[in-house]
């Protein structure tokens, strides 16, 4: 049965040329993290894995860094990055819990950021 | 400077098998993993698969879990990417990197068409 929640920073938006960070956060549960996928749609950004560590997909590796955490920060932001962010946590024994972030990239310099929360 | 050497690409027809093999002139890794990567015509290059240097823990692209399996011979200096229930979209080439993450040598890469 899968009893845990993700909580996500929610619907943001940045200023083109800035940087953000994606959070997500896993709670509720006692199963064991054994890989986090951080996805645009259906094209993969970055795999944090338990034992490999990180993976940065190579067409983002300019861009985009690892954390916090198991967080992921994107940088040099582009309207083009407006869109759609997923979180997927893969758990044993739960299984697959996602996450869904929107981000709006703003050409404004007047970009008001969602709401955000540290994990301890 | 390390040289990779992909090979065992070919024309295969759907629901096939191929072996890919990868040969390093050093040691298969420099990090403590290495992957394999694919690049489609007009698409980016992307992870296929990738396994650690322990060979304890692998990782697969959700489009090929359950079809490919990766492994690693570290006395051969050579990496393995057995291909089963190949289908048209896993038409690409196929290159092999020391380090999942930091790409710094990429060899030739092989080709592999999927076609009936």
């Known amino acids: 049965m899968m009893t845990g929640t993700i909580e996500t920073t929610g619907n943001i938006s940045a200023e083109k040329g800035g940087s953000i960070i994606l959070q997500c956060h896993l709670s509720s549960t006692t199963a064991q993290v054994t890989q986090v996928n951080w996805e645009q749609q259906d094209q993969l950004l970055a795999i944090c894995n338990a034992d490999l560590g990180w993976h940065i997909s190579p067409s983002f590796k300019d861009r985009v860094a690892p954390g916090p955490g198991l967080g992921l920060t994107l940088q040099s932001l582009t309207v083009n990055d407006t869109g759609e962010y997923f979180c997927i946590y893969h758990t044993y024994p739960d299984g697959t819990y996602t996450g869904r972030i929107f981000l709006e990239v703003l050409e404004s310099s007047v970009a008001e950021h969602g709401a955000r929360f540290q994990i301890p | 400077e390390v040289q990779l050497v992909e090979s065992g690409g070919g024309l295969v027809q759907p629901g096939g098998s191929l072996r890919l093999s990868c040969a390093a002139s050093?040691?298969?890794?420099?990090?403590?993993?290495m992957g394999w990567f694919r690049q489609a015509p007009g698409k980016e290059r992307e992870l296929v698969a990738a396994?650690?240097?322990?060979?304890?823990?692998?990782v697969y692209a959700d489009s090929v879990k359950g079809r490919f399996t990766i492994s690693a011979d570290n006395s051969k200096n050579t990496a393995y990417l057995q291909m089963n229930s190949l289908k048209p979209e896993d038409t690409a080439v196929y290159y092999c990197?020391?380090?999942?993450?930091?790409?710094?040598?990429w060899g030739q890469g092989t080709l592999v068409t999927v076609s009936s």
């Open positions: 050093g040691s298969i890794f420099s990090g403590n993993a």
């Open positions: 396994i650690s240097n322990s060979a304890s823990s692998t």
């Open positions: 990197a020391r380090d999942w993450n930091l790409f710094d040598y």
